[in-house]
Interface confidence: low
């Protein structure tokens, strides 16, 4: 005999108190699969958490963190203060950017310094963990008689730094 509850779709539950008919999930609850005997309470994003996706009758709410904090954990069940400039967040915590990479923000990843020589430029200002290098004029432009200084080339699209 087929379980009558198996016919109840997501967004409903099989109500034992009402002859196993499919009742819609009450407010602030959801069921993401069919055949459920109860609906789960929606996750509430409070305090340092903010709502990224509202709860619906078929899916739970999703949270992220308020400005100045970042998610920790696969389901963003924790919020932690952002890293400092010159760092990136890894599973091992906030880590300083490796030599040759930088991060000028409190979130995101460390990115490689611009390679000035790819554009035929020289390094005008060395890079740090917090700042990209500044490219200057090409060596040829610095020779006597050069008429103008070429403005620095825009930084290339950053790639991921190896960790």
């Amino acid at each position: 005999l087929q379980d009558p509850c198996s016919n109840c779709p997501a967004g409903t539950f099989c109500d034992n108190n009402r002859n196993q008919i499919c009742s819609p999930c009450p407010p602030n609850s959801f069921s993401s699969a069919g055949g459920q005997r109860t609906c789960d309470i929606c996750r509430q994003c409070k305090g340092v958490f903010r709502t990224r996706k509202e709860c619906s009758s078929t899916s739970n709410a999703e949270c992220d963190c308020t400005p100045g904090f970042h998610c920790l954990g696969a389901g963003c069940s924790m919020c932690e203060q952002d890293c400092k400039q010159g760092q990136e967040l890894t599973k091992k915590g906030c880590k300083d950017c490796c030599f040759g990479t930088f991060n000028d923000q409190k979130r995101g990843i460390c990115r490689p310094w611009t390679n000035c020589s790819l554009d035929g430029k020289s390094v005008l200002v060395n890079g740090t963990k917090e700042r990209d290098v500044v490219c200057g004029p090409s060596p040829a432009d610095l020779s006597p008689g050069a008429s103008s200084v070429t403005p620095p080339a825009p930084a290339r699209e950053p790639g991921h730094s190896p960790q």
């Epitope: 920790l72 954990g73 696969a74 389901g75 069940s77 924790m78 599973k91």
Partner: antibody, heavy 117, light 108 residues
Amino acid sequence: EVQLQQSGAEVKKPGATVKLSCKASGFNIKDYYIHWVNQRPGQGLEWIGRIDPEDGDIAYAPKFQDRATLTVDTSTNTAYLELSSLRSEDTAVYYCTTGNYYAMDFWGQGTTVTVSS
Amino acid sequence: QIVLTQSPATLSASPGERVTLSCTASSSVSSSYLHWYQQKPGSSPKLWIYSTSNLASGVPARFSGSGPGTSYTLTISSMEPEDAATYYCHQYHRSPPTFGQGTKLEIK
């Protein structure tokens, strides 16, 4: 949606080996440690070990050092626990859980392993 | 390894009652690495409080956590029926990570 889907229940004889799987979806397994924790019937939680899928770094609890092997297949986003030389006291629910440098935050549904002759 | 001892083993509380669960560590644990999990029968544990006093996402505000060093507490300001569960403290300060034996909280 973030999920850790664990393999089905296993019944094994003493001395046998069991290999459990834990498939991650909704996130990249390389971004987190994967821990394994067991819970014997009516008992508390016990840490077995963890693996960093990014670089293969592994740590085991001393109790499981000689019998547990943690592996990961990053191409399928799946982590594995192999436990050898099974004995009756290994009868337990085995959980995989994601973690970072200080907590375990998201847990699979668990796999029941029964060791019986 | 760090041993975590929880007390009481079982506690029965009435709705609306204030509840305090205790976790004592055999040696000092940094507050950043002391967490609490909630587990209901037949379900996986859920991270409940992290780093001593921070509520995990979705945890009701009636829960709080406190404690430095070796003595930590989880408090429920006003017990609700859905709070009936087993609560485990957990340290990740020293390897191997360890759990307390759990406190089973029942509703009267």
